[in-house]
Protein backbone atom coordinates (compact mmCIF):
# COMPACT_ATOMS: atom_id res chain seq x y z
CA UNK A 1 0.00 0.00 0.00
CA UNK A 2 2.80 2.34 -0.60
CA UNK A 3 2.22 5.64 -2.35
CA UNK A 4 2.77 5.60 -6.05
CA UNK A 5 5.60 7.22 -7.93
CA UNK A 6 5.19 7.93 -11.55
CA UNK A 7 6.87 8.67 -14.79
CA UNK A 8 5.28 10.85 -17.40
CA UNK A 9 5.21 10.94 -21.13
CA UNK A 10 6.20 14.58 -20.84
CA UNK A 11 9.34 13.61 -18.90
CA UNK A 12 10.75 10.45 -20.48
CA UNK A 13 13.30 8.48 -18.49
CA UNK A 14 16.83 8.75 -19.76
CA UNK A 15 18.74 5.51 -20.00
CA UNK A 16 22.25 6.12 -18.79
CA UNK A 17 25.41 5.35 -20.68
CA UNK A 18 28.51 4.15 -18.88
CA UNK A 19 31.15 6.85 -18.83
CA UNK A 20 34.82 6.98 -18.13
CA UNK A 21 34.41 10.56 -16.88
CA UNK A 22 34.11 11.25 -13.15
CA UNK A 23 30.39 11.22 -12.27
CA UNK A 24 28.66 14.56 -12.54
CA UNK A 25 26.26 15.53 -9.74
CA UNK A 26 23.22 14.98 -11.96
CA UNK A 27 24.49 12.21 -14.18
CA UNK A 28 22.38 9.07 -14.41
CA UNK A 29 24.08 5.93 -13.04
CA UNK A 30 24.78 3.01 -15.34
CA UNK A 31 21.89 0.53 -15.57
CA UNK A 32 19.43 3.13 -14.32
CA UNK A 33 16.80 5.38 -15.85
CA UNK A 34 16.49 8.94 -14.66
CA UNK A 35 13.97 11.75 -14.95
CA UNK A 36 15.07 15.03 -13.47
CA UNK A 37 11.62 16.46 -14.20
CA UNK A 38 10.03 13.77 -12.01
CA UNK A 39 13.00 13.71 -9.59
CA UNK A 40 12.99 9.96 -10.07
CA UNK A 41 15.68 7.31 -10.59
CA UNK A 42 14.77 3.73 -11.45
CA UNK A 43 17.37 0.97 -11.27
CA UNK A 44 14.97 -1.91 -11.61
CA UNK A 45 15.59 -5.61 -12.35
CA UNK A 46 19.23 -5.00 -13.24
CA UNK A 47 20.86 -7.51 -10.85
CA UNK A 48 22.75 -4.73 -9.10
CA UNK A 49 24.88 -6.00 -6.23
CA UNK A 50 25.38 -2.61 -4.59
CA UNK A 51 23.74 0.78 -4.44
CA UNK A 52 25.05 3.01 -7.25
CA UNK A 53 27.50 5.56 -5.92
CA UNK A 54 26.73 8.23 -8.51
CA UNK A 55 23.07 8.91 -7.82
CA UNK A 56 21.99 12.39 -8.95
CA UNK A 57 21.49 14.93 -6.20
CA UNK A 58 17.98 15.76 -7.42
CA UNK A 59 16.63 12.28 -6.67
CA UNK A 60 13.45 12.24 -4.59
CA UNK A 61 12.08 8.85 -5.65
CA UNK A 62 14.57 5.99 -5.90
CA UNK A 63 13.53 2.54 -7.08
CA UNK A 64 16.11 -0.19 -6.55
CA UNK A 65 13.74 -3.11 -6.88
CA UNK A 66 14.45 -6.56 -8.28
CA UNK A 67 18.19 -6.53 -7.73
CA UNK A 68 20.69 -8.69 -5.84
CA UNK A 69 21.95 -6.34 -3.17
CA UNK A 70 22.42 -9.00 -0.43
CA UNK A 71 23.78 -6.53 2.17
CA UNK A 72 23.01 -2.90 2.93
CA UNK A 73 26.04 -1.64 4.87
CA UNK A 74 26.16 1.37 7.16
CA UNK A 75 25.98 4.55 5.10
CA UNK A 76 24.77 2.72 1.99
CA UNK A 77 23.20 5.97 0.79
CA UNK A 78 25.60 8.43 2.40
CA UNK A 79 27.04 10.79 -0.20
CA UNK A 80 28.95 14.04 -0.14
CA UNK A 81 27.00 16.22 -0.59
CA UNK A 82 24.13 14.17 0.85
CA UNK A 83 21.06 12.99 -1.04
CA UNK A 84 19.11 15.65 0.81
CA UNK A 85 16.00 15.32 -1.37
CA UNK A 86 15.53 11.55 -1.26
CA UNK A 87 11.98 11.07 0.04
CA UNK A 88 10.87 7.63 -1.15
CA UNK A 89 13.17 4.62 -1.32
CA UNK A 90 11.93 1.29 -2.66
CA UNK A 91 14.25 -1.68 -2.17
CA UNK A 92 11.65 -4.41 -2.47
CA UNK A 93 12.56 -7.76 -3.96
CA UNK A 94 16.28 -7.09 -4.06
CA UNK A 95 17.43 -10.25 -2.27
CA UNK A 96 18.58 -8.36 0.78
CA UNK A 97 19.39 -10.68 3.64
CA UNK A 98 21.22 -8.20 5.86
CA UNK A 99 20.47 -4.58 6.73
CA UNK A 100 23.13 -3.15 9.00
CA UNK A 101 23.00 -0.33 11.52
CA UNK A 102 23.07 3.11 9.94
CA UNK A 103 22.13 1.80 6.47
CA UNK A 104 19.81 4.79 5.96
CA UNK A 105 21.85 7.48 7.66
CA UNK A 106 22.41 10.84 5.98
CA UNK A 107 19.02 10.80 4.26
CA UNK A 108 17.39 13.76 6.02
CA UNK A 109 14.19 13.74 3.93
CA UNK A 110 13.53 10.00 3.77
CA UNK A 111 9.79 9.69 4.38
CA UNK A 112 8.93 6.33 2.88
CA UNK A 113 11.01 3.13 2.92
CA UNK A 114 9.95 -0.17 1.37
CA UNK A 115 12.01 -3.24 2.22
CA UNK A 116 9.29 -5.75 1.34
CA UNK A 117 9.99 -9.15 -0.17
CA UNK A 118 13.54 -9.38 1.08
CA UNK A 119 14.46 -12.40 3.22
CA UNK A 120 16.02 -10.47 6.10
CA UNK A 121 18.02 -12.94 8.14
CA UNK A 122 19.61 -9.97 9.90
CA UNK A 123 18.01 -6.61 10.56
CA UNK A 124 20.21 -4.53 12.82
CA UNK A 125 18.52 -2.99 15.86
CA UNK A 126 20.01 0.28 14.60
CA UNK A 127 18.91 -0.05 10.97
CA UNK A 128 16.43 2.81 11.33
CA UNK A 129 17.81 4.71 14.31
CA UNK A 130 21.35 4.85 13.00
CA UNK A 131 22.94 4.81 16.46
CA UNK A 132 23.01 2.74 19.61
CA UNK A 133 22.10 5.68 21.83
CA UNK A 134 19.17 5.07 24.16
CA UNK A 135 17.46 8.05 22.54
CA UNK A 136 18.51 8.75 18.94
CA UNK A 137 17.82 11.69 16.70
CA UNK A 138 14.30 11.28 15.33
CA UNK A 139 14.11 9.44 12.03
CA UNK A 140 12.31 11.36 9.28
CA UNK A 141 10.53 8.13 8.28
CA UNK A 142 6.76 8.36 8.07
CA UNK A 143 5.96 5.15 6.18
CA UNK A 144 7.83 1.89 6.71
CA UNK A 145 6.82 -1.07 4.58
CA UNK A 146 8.14 -4.42 5.76
CA UNK A 147 5.81 -6.94 4.15
CA UNK A 148 7.14 -10.46 3.64
CA UNK A 149 10.62 -9.91 5.01
CA UNK A 150 10.73 -13.19 6.92
CA UNK A 151 13.66 -15.37 5.82
CA UNK A 152 13.32 -19.08 5.10
CA UNK A 153 13.60 -21.30 8.19
CA UNK A 154 17.14 -22.39 7.39
CA UNK A 155 18.35 -18.76 7.28
CA UNK A 156 16.84 -17.64 10.58
CA UNK A 157 19.06 -16.50 13.41
CA UNK A 158 18.70 -18.17 16.81
CA UNK A 159 16.71 -15.25 18.20
CA UNK A 160 13.06 -14.85 17.30
CA UNK A 161 12.30 -13.04 14.08
CA UNK A 162 9.56 -11.06 15.84
CA UNK A 163 12.09 -9.90 18.43
CA UNK A 164 14.61 -8.87 15.79
CA UNK A 165 12.08 -6.73 13.93
CA UNK A 166 10.75 -5.26 17.15
CA UNK A 167 14.23 -4.25 18.28
CA UNK A 168 14.75 -2.30 15.07
CA UNK A 169 11.39 -0.56 15.43
CA UNK A 170 11.94 0.64 19.00
CA UNK A 171 15.68 1.38 19.05
CA UNK A 172 16.43 4.88 20.25
CA UNK A 173 12.76 5.82 20.02
CA UNK A 174 13.70 7.01 16.55
CA UNK A 175 10.40 6.12 14.89
CA UNK A 176 8.12 8.23 17.07
CA UNK A 177 6.91 10.03 13.94
CA UNK A 178 6.02 6.87 12.02
CA UNK A 179 2.48 7.03 10.63
CA UNK A 180 2.30 3.85 8.58
CA UNK A 181 3.79 0.45 9.36
CA UNK A 182 3.19 -2.61 7.23
CA UNK A 183 4.26 -5.98 8.61
CA UNK A 184 2.06 -8.30 6.59
CA UNK A 185 3.00 -11.87 5.65
CA UNK A 186 5.83 -12.36 8.14
CA UNK A 187 4.73 -15.52 9.98
CA UNK A 188 4.57 -13.52 13.21
CA UNK A 189 3.33 -15.71 16.06
CA UNK A 190 3.11 -12.77 18.45
CA UNK A 191 3.65 -9.05 18.62
CA UNK A 192 6.36 -8.13 21.12
CA UNK A 193 4.82 -6.37 24.07
CA UNK A 194 6.43 -2.93 23.97
CA UNK A 195 6.59 -2.24 20.24
CA UNK A 196 3.42 -0.20 19.84
CA UNK A 197 4.18 1.92 22.89
CA UNK A 198 7.21 3.28 21.00
CA UNK A 199 5.17 4.15 17.89
CA UNK A 200 2.64 6.67 19.21
CA UNK A 201 2.01 8.42 15.88
CA UNK A 202 0.81 5.34 14.00
CA UNK A 203 -2.25 5.89 11.84
CA UNK A 204 -2.08 2.68 9.82
CA UNK A 205 -0.87 -0.69 11.05
CA UNK A 206 -0.98 -3.77 8.84
CA UNK A 207 -0.40 -7.11 10.56
CA UNK A 208 -2.43 -9.15 8.10
CA UNK A 209 -1.50 -12.63 6.90
CA UNK A 210 0.58 -13.52 9.93
CA UNK A 211 0.09 -16.27 12.51
CA UNK A 212 -1.02 -14.18 15.45
CA UNK A 213 -2.94 -16.34 17.91
CA UNK A 214 -3.66 -13.78 20.60
CA UNK A 215 -3.50 -10.06 21.30
CA UNK A 216 -3.70 -10.50 25.07
CA UNK A 217 -0.32 -8.91 25.76
CA UNK A 218 -0.54 -6.24 23.07
CA UNK A 219 -1.57 -2.76 24.14
CA UNK A 220 -3.17 -0.38 21.64
CA UNK A 221 -3.98 2.17 24.34
CA UNK A 222 -1.54 4.89 23.32
CA UNK A 223 -2.24 4.66 19.58
CA UNK A 224 -4.69 7.53 19.74
CA UNK A 225 -4.14 8.46 16.07
CA UNK A 226 -4.70 4.95 14.73
CA UNK A 227 -7.11 4.89 11.79
CA UNK A 228 -6.67 1.41 10.29
CA UNK A 229 -5.67 -1.82 12.00
CA UNK A 230 -5.39 -4.80 9.68
CA UNK A 231 -5.53 -8.17 11.38
CA UNK A 232 -7.01 -10.23 8.56
CA UNK A 233 -5.73 -13.74 7.83
CA UNK A 234 -4.19 -14.50 11.20
CA UNK A 235 -4.82 -17.27 13.74
CA UNK A 236 -6.87 -15.24 16.19
CA UNK A 237 -9.34 -17.30 18.22
CA UNK A 238 -10.99 -14.63 20.33
CA UNK A 239 -10.45 -11.03 21.45
CA UNK A 240 -10.67 -10.58 25.19
CA UNK A 241 -12.23 -7.73 27.15
CA UNK A 242 -9.03 -5.76 27.64
CA UNK A 243 -8.35 -5.66 23.91
CA UNK A 244 -11.96 -4.86 23.08
CA UNK A 245 -11.99 -1.93 25.50
CA UNK A 246 -8.73 -0.55 24.13
CA UNK A 247 -9.94 -0.74 20.53
CA UNK A 248 -13.25 0.87 21.44
CA UNK A 249 -11.35 3.69 23.11
CA UNK A 250 -9.44 4.68 19.98
CA UNK A 251 -11.27 7.64 18.44
CA UNK A 252 -10.67 7.06 14.72
CA UNK A 253 -9.88 3.38 14.31
CA UNK A 254 -11.28 0.89 11.82
CA UNK A 255 -10.35 -2.74 12.51
CA UNK A 256 -10.26 -5.50 9.91
CA UNK A 257 -10.67 -9.02 11.29
CA UNK A 258 -11.66 -11.19 8.33
CA UNK A 259 -10.41 -14.77 7.89
CA UNK A 260 -9.45 -15.65 11.43
CA UNK A 261 -10.35 -19.03 12.97
CA UNK A 262 -12.73 -17.72 15.62
CA UNK A 263 -13.55 -20.21 18.36
CA UNK A 264 -17.21 -19.84 19.25
CA UNK A 265 -17.38 -21.18 22.77
CA UNK A 266 -18.16 -19.54 26.11
CA UNK A 267 -15.02 -17.35 25.89
CA UNK A 268 -16.45 -15.66 22.79
CA UNK A 269 -19.48 -14.17 24.56
CA UNK A 270 -17.90 -10.80 25.35
CA UNK A 271 -16.56 -10.38 21.84
CA UNK A 272 -19.95 -11.18 20.29
CA UNK A 273 -21.66 -8.66 22.57
CA UNK A 274 -19.06 -6.06 21.62
CA UNK A 275 -19.33 -6.79 17.90
CA UNK A 276 -23.07 -6.22 17.99
CA UNK A 277 -22.67 -2.71 19.34
CA UNK A 278 -19.37 -1.47 17.92
CA UNK A 279 -18.83 0.53 14.77
CA UNK A 280 -15.10 -0.11 14.90
CA UNK A 281 -14.98 -3.41 12.99
CA UNK A 282 -15.26 -3.20 9.21
CA UNK A 283 -17.21 -6.02 7.58
CA UNK A 284 -18.20 -7.45 10.94
CA UNK A 285 -21.13 -9.25 9.33
CA UNK A 286 -18.62 -11.44 7.47
CA UNK A 287 -16.99 -12.86 10.60
CA UNK A 288 -17.79 -16.55 11.09
CA UNK A 289 -16.89 -19.32 13.52
CA UNK A 290 -14.27 -21.89 12.63
CA UNK A 291 -14.53 -23.99 15.80
CA UNK A 292 -16.00 -26.03 17.35
CA UNK A 293 -17.18 -28.15 14.48
CA UNK A 294 -20.86 -27.72 15.34
CA UNK A 295 -20.47 -23.93 15.05
CA UNK A 296 -18.48 -23.81 11.83
CA UNK A 297 -19.55 -21.04 9.42
CA UNK A 298 -22.03 -19.53 11.89
CA UNK A 299 -22.03 -15.73 11.68
CA UNK A 300 -20.71 -14.19 14.89
CA UNK A 301 -23.26 -11.39 14.84
CA UNK A 302 -26.09 -13.91 14.80
CA UNK A 303 -24.96 -15.78 17.91
CA UNK A 304 -26.51 -15.40 21.34
CA UNK A 305 -25.27 -16.45 24.73
CA UNK A 306 -27.08 -19.79 24.56
CA UNK A 307 -25.02 -20.71 21.47
CA UNK A 308 -21.73 -20.06 23.24
CA UNK A 309 -21.11 -22.90 25.62
CA UNK A 310 -18.01 -24.69 26.81
CA UNK A 311 -18.08 -28.44 27.16
CA UNK A 312 -17.53 -29.33 30.81
CA UNK A 313 -14.14 -30.85 31.46
CA UNK A 314 -14.72 -34.45 32.40
CA UNK A 315 -12.60 -36.13 35.07
CA UNK A 316 -9.98 -38.41 33.49
CA UNK A 317 -11.81 -41.58 34.47
CA UNK A 318 -14.84 -40.52 32.46
CA UNK A 319 -13.04 -39.16 29.41
CA UNK A 320 -13.47 -41.09 26.20
CA UNK A 321 -11.82 -40.69 22.86
Amino acid sequence: TSSASSSSSSAPFLASAASAQPPLPDQCPALCECSEAARTVKCVNRNLTEVPTDLPLYVRNLFLTGNQLAVLPAGAFARRPPLAELAALNLSGSRLDEVRGGAFEHLPSLRQLDLSHNPLAYLSPFAFSGSNASISAPSPLVELILNHIVPPDDKRQNRSFEGMVAAALVAGRALQGLHLLELASNHFLYLPRDVLAQLPSLRYLDLSNNSLVSLTYVSFRNLTHLESLHLEDNALKVLHNGTLAELQGLPHVRVFLDNNPWVCDCHMADMVTWLKQTGVVQGKDRLTCAFPEKMRNRVLLELNSADLDCDPILPPSLQTS
Epitope: S2, S3, Y58
Partner: antibody
Framework: EVQLLESGGGLVQPGGSLRLSCAAS????????MSWVRQAPGKCLEWVSA????????YYADSVKGRFTISRDNSKNTLYLQMNSLRAEDTAVYYC??????????????WGQGTLVTVSS | DIQMTQSPSSLSASVGDRVTITCRAS??????LNWYQQKPGKAPKLLIY???SLQSGVPSRFSGSGSGTDFTLTISSLQPEDSATYYC?????????FGCGTKLEIK
Amino acid sequence: EVQLLESGGGLVQPGGSLRLSCAASGFTFSSYAMSWVRQAPGKCLEWVSAISGSGGSTYYADSVKGRFTISRDNSKNTLYLQMNSLRAEDTAVYYCARYYGGYYSAWMDYWGQGTLVTVSS
Amino acid sequence: DIQMTQSPSSLSASVGDRVTITCRASQSISSFLNWYQQKPGKAPKLLIYAASSLQSGVPSRFSGSGSGTDFTLTISSLQPEDSATYYCQQTYGYLHTFGCGTKLEIK
Protein backbone atom coordinates in the same frame (compact mmCIF):
# COMPACT_ATOMS: atom_id res chain seq x y z
CA GLU B 1 -3.87 16.22 -23.35
CA VAL B 2 -4.33 15.75 -19.61
CA GLN B 3 -7.87 16.52 -18.47
CA LEU B 4 -9.58 16.31 -15.08
CA LEU B 5 -13.33 16.84 -14.86
CA GLU B 6 -15.10 17.01 -11.50
CA SER B 7 -18.80 16.33 -11.02
CA GLY B 8 -21.28 15.57 -8.24
CA GLY B 9 -21.38 18.91 -6.47
CA GLY B 10 -24.61 20.55 -5.40
CA LEU B 11 -26.74 21.68 -2.50
CA VAL B 12 -27.02 19.36 0.48
CA GLN B 13 -28.39 19.75 4.00
CA PRO B 14 -26.14 19.63 7.08
CA GLY B 15 -25.59 16.02 8.08
CA GLY B 16 -26.16 14.85 4.51
CA SER B 17 -23.89 13.05 2.08
CA LEU B 18 -22.51 13.66 -1.37
CA ARG B 19 -20.13 11.82 -3.67
CA LEU B 20 -17.81 13.76 -5.95
CA SER B 21 -16.22 12.21 -9.01
CA CYS B 22 -13.23 13.25 -11.08
CA ALA B 23 -12.92 11.74 -14.55
CA ALA B 24 -9.33 11.68 -15.77
CA SER B 25 -8.04 11.34 -19.31
CA GLY B 26 -4.87 11.87 -21.31
CA PHE B 27 -2.49 10.01 -18.99
CA THR B 28 -1.94 6.62 -17.34
CA PHE B 29 -4.24 7.21 -14.39
CA SER B 30 -2.99 4.34 -12.20
CA SER B 31 0.56 5.69 -12.25
CA TYR B 32 -0.29 8.90 -10.43
CA ALA B 33 -1.27 9.82 -6.93
CA MET B 34 -4.33 12.08 -6.90
CA SER B 35 -5.73 14.64 -4.51
CA TRP B 36 -8.75 16.71 -3.56
CA VAL B 37 -8.26 20.36 -2.63
CA ARG B 38 -11.07 22.72 -1.64
CA GLN B 39 -11.60 26.45 -1.42
CA ALA B 40 -14.38 28.03 0.59
CA PRO B 41 -15.83 31.23 -0.92
CA GLY B 42 -13.26 34.00 -0.59
CA LYS B 43 -10.92 31.79 1.43
CA CYS B 44 -7.58 29.99 1.06
CA LEU B 45 -6.88 26.70 -0.64
CA GLU B 46 -7.20 23.75 1.75
CA TRP B 47 -5.67 20.35 1.02
CA VAL B 48 -8.35 17.76 1.81
CA SER B 49 -7.22 14.27 0.87
CA ALA B 50 -4.92 12.24 -1.35
CA ILE B 51 -4.59 8.68 -2.59
CA SER B 52 -1.71 6.71 -4.06
CA GLY B 53 -1.77 5.42 -7.62
CA SER B 54 -2.72 1.92 -6.56
CA GLY B 55 -5.33 3.20 -4.13
CA GLY B 56 -3.61 1.44 -1.27
CA SER B 57 -2.56 4.52 0.68
CA THR B 58 -4.95 7.30 1.62
CA TYR B 59 -4.37 10.58 3.44
CA TYR B 60 -6.84 13.01 5.04
CA ALA B 61 -6.77 16.48 6.55
CA ASP B 62 -7.78 16.42 10.20
CA SER B 63 -10.82 18.55 9.39
CA VAL B 64 -12.41 15.77 7.30
CA LYS B 65 -10.96 12.62 8.85
CA GLY B 66 -13.66 10.07 9.63
CA ARG B 67 -16.24 11.88 7.49
CA PHE B 68 -14.71 11.84 4.00
CA THR B 69 -13.42 8.84 2.08
CA ILE B 70 -11.20 9.10 -0.98
CA SER B 71 -11.10 6.23 -3.45
CA ARG B 72 -10.34 5.51 -7.07
CA ASP B 73 -11.35 3.11 -9.80
CA ASN B 74 -8.34 2.70 -12.05
CA SER B 75 -10.34 0.68 -14.56
CA LYS B 76 -12.63 3.69 -15.02
CA ASN B 77 -9.93 6.37 -14.68
CA THR B 78 -12.02 7.99 -11.97
CA LEU B 79 -11.26 9.51 -8.58
CA TYR B 80 -13.98 9.79 -5.91
CA LEU B 81 -14.61 11.68 -2.69
CA GLN B 82 -17.42 10.34 -0.52
CA MET B 83 -18.49 13.09 1.87
CA ASN B 84 -20.65 12.16 4.87
CA SER B 85 -21.89 14.13 7.89
CA LEU B 86 -21.50 17.34 5.93
CA ARG B 87 -21.24 20.64 7.78
CA ALA B 88 -21.72 24.25 6.73
CA GLU B 89 -17.96 24.73 6.85
CA ASP B 90 -17.54 22.10 4.12
CA THR B 91 -19.10 24.53 1.65
CA ALA B 92 -16.44 25.11 -1.01
CA VAL B 93 -15.34 24.55 -4.55
CA TYR B 94 -13.70 21.11 -4.65
CA TYR B 95 -10.84 20.58 -7.07
CA CYS B 96 -9.24 17.30 -8.05
CA ALA B 97 -5.56 17.47 -8.88
CA ARG B 98 -2.87 15.13 -10.14
CA TYR B 99 0.34 14.60 -8.23
CA TYR B 100 3.48 14.37 -10.31
CA GLY B 101 6.00 12.07 -8.65
CA GLY B 102 5.57 10.21 -5.38
CA TYR B 103 3.21 11.47 -2.69
CA TYR B 104 6.00 12.72 -0.43
CA SER B 105 8.02 14.32 -3.17
CA ALA B 106 5.40 15.68 -5.46
CA TRP B 107 3.59 18.68 -6.79
CA MET B 108 0.17 19.09 -8.36
CA ASP B 109 0.73 19.69 -12.03
CA TYR B 110 -2.83 19.42 -13.38
CA TRP B 111 -6.08 20.59 -11.80
CA GLY B 112 -9.72 20.26 -12.70
CA GLN B 113 -11.98 23.28 -12.89
CA GLY B 114 -13.77 22.43 -9.66
CA THR B 115 -17.29 21.56 -8.51
CA LEU B 116 -19.23 23.61 -5.96
CA VAL B 117 -20.57 21.93 -2.82
CA THR B 118 -23.02 23.97 -0.75
CA VAL B 119 -24.06 22.73 2.68
CA SER B 120 -27.07 24.66 3.90
CA SER B 121 -30.48 24.09 5.38
CA ASP C 1 0.97 19.14 11.00
CA ILE C 2 3.25 21.59 9.23
CA GLN C 3 1.92 25.16 9.09
CA MET C 4 2.74 27.46 6.18
CA THR C 5 2.73 31.23 6.68
CA GLN C 6 2.78 33.58 3.70
CA SER C 7 3.59 37.24 3.69
CA PRO C 8 2.42 39.73 2.81
CA SER C 9 -1.23 38.72 2.65
CA SER C 10 -1.71 41.26 -0.12
CA LEU C 11 0.37 43.74 -2.06
CA SER C 12 0.03 46.20 -4.90
CA ALA C 13 2.81 46.82 -7.43
CA SER C 14 3.34 48.43 -10.80
CA VAL C 15 4.04 46.82 -14.15
CA GLY C 16 7.79 46.24 -14.46
CA ASP C 17 8.35 46.06 -10.69
CA ARG C 18 10.28 43.28 -9.04
CA VAL C 19 7.95 41.51 -6.60
CA THR C 20 8.89 39.14 -3.79
CA ILE C 21 6.49 36.89 -1.83
CA THR C 22 7.72 34.85 1.11
CA CYS C 23 6.56 31.61 2.67
CA ARG C 24 7.71 30.21 6.00
CA ALA C 25 7.24 26.64 7.22
CA SER C 26 6.75 25.77 10.89
CA GLN C 27 9.54 23.18 10.58
CA SER C 28 12.21 22.34 8.06
CA ILE C 29 10.78 20.99 4.82
CA SER C 30 14.06 20.81 2.86
CA SER C 31 13.01 21.95 -0.64
CA PHE C 32 9.62 20.24 -0.68
CA LEU C 33 7.79 23.44 -1.53
CA ASN C 34 5.63 24.39 -4.51
CA TRP C 35 4.12 27.67 -5.69
CA TYR C 36 0.76 28.06 -7.42
CA GLN C 37 -1.00 30.96 -9.09
CA GLN C 38 -4.79 31.32 -8.97
CA LYS C 39 -6.90 33.84 -10.81
CA PRO C 40 -10.51 34.58 -9.77
CA GLY C 41 -12.93 31.83 -10.74
CA LYS C 42 -10.13 29.61 -12.05
CA ALA C 43 -8.28 26.55 -10.82
CA PRO C 44 -4.78 26.99 -9.40
CA LYS C 45 -1.85 26.64 -11.78
CA LEU C 46 1.56 25.23 -10.88
CA LEU C 47 4.39 27.77 -11.23
CA ILE C 48 7.35 26.43 -9.27
CA TYR C 49 8.01 22.98 -7.84
CA ALA C 50 10.77 21.67 -5.59
CA ALA C 51 11.35 25.25 -4.34
CA SER C 52 13.16 26.45 -7.43
CA SER C 53 12.21 24.44 -10.55
CA LEU C 54 10.15 26.31 -13.13
CA GLN C 55 7.16 24.37 -14.42
CA SER C 56 7.10 23.91 -18.18
CA GLY C 57 5.32 26.77 -19.94
CA VAL C 58 5.67 29.24 -17.08
CA PRO C 59 7.38 32.52 -18.03
CA SER C 60 10.99 32.83 -16.89
CA ARG C 61 10.25 36.03 -14.95
CA PHE C 62 8.98 33.71 -12.19
CA SER C 63 11.61 32.16 -9.95
CA GLY C 64 11.72 30.41 -6.60
CA SER C 65 14.38 30.04 -3.97
CA GLY C 66 14.90 28.85 -0.43
CA SER C 67 15.37 25.69 1.57
CA GLY C 68 14.55 24.54 5.07
CA THR C 69 11.93 26.90 6.48
CA ASP C 70 12.16 30.10 4.39
CA PHE C 71 11.16 30.35 0.75
CA THR C 72 10.68 33.12 -1.77
CA LEU C 73 8.74 33.53 -5.00
CA THR C 74 10.08 36.35 -7.15
CA ILE C 75 8.57 37.98 -10.22
CA SER C 76 11.43 39.85 -11.84
CA SER C 77 9.34 42.21 -13.98
CA LEU C 78 5.66 42.33 -13.17
CA GLN C 79 3.21 42.00 -16.05
CA PRO C 80 -0.52 42.87 -16.08
CA GLU C 81 -1.49 39.19 -16.39
CA ASP C 82 0.33 38.41 -13.12
CA SER C 83 -2.53 39.86 -11.08
CA ALA C 84 -3.61 36.83 -9.05
CA THR C 85 -3.37 35.11 -5.67
CA TYR C 86 -0.19 33.09 -5.07
CA TYR C 87 -0.08 30.07 -2.77
CA CYS C 88 2.78 28.03 -1.40
CA GLN C 89 2.35 24.33 -0.54
CA GLN C 90 4.57 21.90 1.34
CA THR C 91 4.70 18.20 0.44
CA TYR C 92 7.20 17.15 3.10
CA GLY C 93 4.75 16.27 5.82
CA TYR C 94 2.42 13.32 6.13
CA LEU C 95 -0.36 15.77 5.32
CA HIS C 96 0.20 18.44 2.70
CA THR C 97 -0.71 22.01 3.52
CA PHE C 98 -1.04 25.33 1.74
CA GLY C 99 -0.23 28.82 2.88
CA CYS C 100 -3.19 31.20 2.96
CA GLY C 101 -2.11 33.08 -0.13
CA THR C 102 -0.78 36.44 -1.20
CA LYS C 103 -3.09 38.56 -3.30
CA LEU C 104 -1.12 40.56 -5.86
CA GLU C 105 -2.76 43.55 -7.54
CA ILE C 106 -1.43 45.75 -10.31
CA LYS C 107 -1.41 49.47 -9.58
